[in-house]
């Protein structure tokens, strides 16, 4: 008898045994996940004010309102400095107001003075129709004022604060544009 | 290593249409812009149209009107439907891809002919 209740007490004893490795189990994987989470939080954290305190525009890019133009340091032909803004995720700048040209034509001057950079305008060569590089039509006052003479394909660009017209294959510096990315904050 | 599949050339017919698909696979983390080149014989290489990676288009004076250029930014792959094709389109298109680590990769291209 006293045997008997001997190994029962031992089994117990065991039992208590595993259900107290089964708590610490549950402790340490509670713990652990508590610090994941903890960690989880953090992280977003970062990535919500890296989010909020990146820039609408790329380092040395100016903003605009929805737009960030970048001034290229180098001259290129039109159809090189085409390809120059599509490696930066971007297109030729394509001038949409008045307001918007007055913007660009101020910064210009502030940046470099008066030279010439290419934009995103070009002449068909059958029809003779500007048209900006997405296949739209320029608004009446931002066609370019002078009429290029040359019998090469005909390139738009801006210079101090008119757009005029050139061969394309002259060298400029240029102007690219893309959207400011906007804040999810 | 950096795959681009073309696919979708052909033989058609002037006034027909082709769609053109361009799928970039392998180890390519970020993509600024993807483009349609192409090349008839004797020519240089030239731009026909490109996306960037915000949907930003760029198109050549010649196709304005009749090519358009799409993107599907989930799968890596960009589209070109070509409609009222004419002769002077023919030629061998290639995809290229501009990556923002700074590199360019071409596809092998796919030939376009437009004849009656």
């Known amino acids: 008898k006293l045997l008997q209740v001997s190994t029962i007490a031992m089994q117990q004893q065991e039992k208590l045994i595993q259900q107290e490795r089964a708590l610490l189990n549950f402790t340490e994987w509670k713990r652990s996940c508590a610090l994941q989470m903890k960690y989880c939080q953090a992280f977003m954290q970062n990535s919500l004010s890296s989010a909020h305190n990146s820039s609408p525009c790329p380092n040395n890019w100016i903003q605009n309102r929805e737009s960030c133009y970048y001034v290229s340091e180098i001259w290129s032909i039109w159809h090189t400095s085409q390809e120059n803004c599509l490696k930066e995720g971007s297109t030729l700048l394509q001038i949409e107001s008045k307001e918007e040209m007055d913007f660009i034509t101020g910064s210009l001057r502030k940046i470099k003075g008066s030279y010439d950079y290419w934009v995103g305008l070009s002449q068909d060569g059958h029809s003779g129709r500007w048209l900006w590089q997405d296949g739209s039509s320029p608004s009446p006052g931002l066609l370019p004022a002078e009429r290029s003479q040359s019998a090469n394909q005909v390139c738009g660009y801006v210079k101090s604060n008119s757009l005029l017209s050139s061969n394309c294959s002259t060298w400029k510096y240029f102007i690219c544009e893309k959207y400011a990315l906007r804040s999810s904050v | 290593q950096v795959q681009l599949q073309e696919s979708g050339g052909g033989l058609v017919q002037p006034g027909g249409s082709l769609r053109l698909s361009c799928a970039a696979s392998?180890?390519?983390?970020?993509?600024?812009?993807m483009g349609w080149y192409r090349q008839a014989p004797g020519n240089q290489r030239e731009l026909v149209a490109a996306i960037t990676n915000q949907g930003r288009v760029t198109y050549a004076d010649s196709v304005k009107g009749r090519f358009t250029i799409s993107r599907d930014g989930a799968k890596n792959t960009v589209y070109l439907q070509m409609n009222s094709l004419k002769p002077e389109d023919t030629a061998v298109y290639y995809c290229?891809?501009?990556?923002?680590?700074?590199?360019?990769?071409w596809g092998k291209g796919t030939q376009v002919t437009v004849s009656s």
């Open positions: 290229k891809v501009f990556a923002a680590s700074g590199m360019e990769y």
């Open positions: 392998g180890s390519i983390s970020s993509i600024n812009a």
